[in-house]
């Protein structure tokens, strides 16, 4: 049996103001069963990125289509990047839980910096 | 893809039984499984879902049923104790499939297997 | 737990018309939702998953629409395979997974 891994493949992102980053997260399980959220920072006061199933996140869209059967690409774009974004962003596999699903696997972090400004 | 369920049979009020499903035609380790049951003349009603070590199991078989797997038999089981009257009914295996990053439907069924608990 | 209410609970249509039945949720599902067809004495069969996604194979005369609470399943000029009793479920919450009661289509 397959052991999920979260892989994302970029340590540093160098992203430009107002353009949009593409952060990359492919897992190479669909076990086990439960949801994939994208956070910045670690800890108890991680930030919310992304949660498909509720949470409205107007500058965040997925690279793969939400109607994807059985994907495993969970990379995300976010448009209109300012300063305030920069950190280093985490795709985290989730466990199904009932109620609460439980935190299973995290992918290894990218970290989002600004580059220079093309001239 | 095939699923073909066996195990069914009459037993009599607080016996036991065991289901099994034999899987073919796809790479079962890969998959959640789950088991739904339609009892005579009545809809459909979900008993129970495992996906790697994770397992899912409805309100009205939780504490008497069991679900478990063996990936190398590419087999799905269901241990089904204390058995009552209104567990009475056909079993089928199911293949889950997923979408929208979390969410579980089922696109491939066995022909099922009839359960009767009677006095 | 969300609760699916399909209805009617039987419709009758004869061969060639169109049927349209719906499936209502107790809470918002936005698309998570399936349909099933079932015929007698035969094992259910995906038809529409993601709310208007047809499966593979499930001929074009089968459409699915709406998103939240409210669904609908259309089968446009029924043919004789098609009288069967067809189920809406939900993925959206989880345990449990919920079937709608079915709806019935029989031959007018």
């Known amino acids: 049996e397959e052991e999920l891994q979260m892989i994302q493949p970029e340590k540093l992102l160098l992203v430009t103001v107002g353009k949009t980053a593409t952060l990359h997260c492919t897992v190479t399980s669909l076990l086990p069963v439960g949801p994939v959220l994208w956070f910045r920072g670690v800890g108890p006061g991680r930030e919310l990125i992304y949660n498909q199933k509720e949470g409205h996140f107007p500058r965040v869209t997925t690279v793969s289509d939400l109607t994807k059967r059985n994907n495993m690409d969970f990379s995300i774009r976010i448009s209109s990047i300012t300063p305030a974004d920069v950190g280093t962003y985490y795709c985290v596999k989730f466990r199904k839980g009932s109620p609460e699903n439980v935190e299973f696997k995290s992918g290894p972090g990218t970290e989002m910096a600004l580059g220079a400004k093309p001239s | 893809v095939q699923l073909v369920e066996s195990g069914g049979g009459v037993v009599r009020p607080g016996e036991s039984l065991r289901l099994s499903c034999a899987a073919s035609g796809f790479r079962f380790s890969n998959f959640a499984m789950t088991w739904v049951r339609q009892a005579p003349g009545e809809g459909l009603e979900w008993v129970s879902t495992i996906g790697s070590g994770d397992t899912y199991y409805a309100d009205s078989v939780k504490g008497r049923f069991t679900i478990s797997r063996d990936n190398s038999k590419n087999t799905l089981y269901l241990q089904m104790n204390s058995l009552r009257a209104e567990d009475t009914a056909v079993y089928y295996c199911?293949?889950?499939?997923?979408?929208?990053?979390?969410?579980?439907?089922?696109?491939?069924w066995g022909l099922g297997t009839l359960v009767t608990v009677s006095s | 737990e969300i609760v699916l209410t399909q209805s009617p609970a039987t419709l009758s249509v004869s061969p060639g018309e169109r049927a349209t039945f719906s499936c209502r949720a107790s809470?918002?599902?936005?698309?998570?939702l399936a349909w099933y067809q079932q015929r007698p004495g035969q094992a259910p069969r995906l038809l529409i998953y993601?709310?208007?996604i047809r499966e593979t194979g499930i001929p074009e005369r089968f459409s699915g629409s709406g998103s939240g609470t409210e669904f609908t399943l259309t089968i446009t000029s029924l043919q004789s395979e098609d009288f069967a009793v067809y189920y809406c479920?939900?993925?959206?919450?989880?345990?449990?997974?919920?079937f709608g009661g079915g709806t019935k289509v029989e031959i007018k």
């Open positions: 809470q918002n599902v936005k698309n998570d």
């Open positions: 199911a293949k889950d499939s997923t979408v929208s990053w979390s969410g579980d439907f089922f696109d491939y």
């Open positions: 993601a709310a208007r």
């Open positions: 479920q939900q993925y959206y919450d989880w345990p449990p997974f919920t």
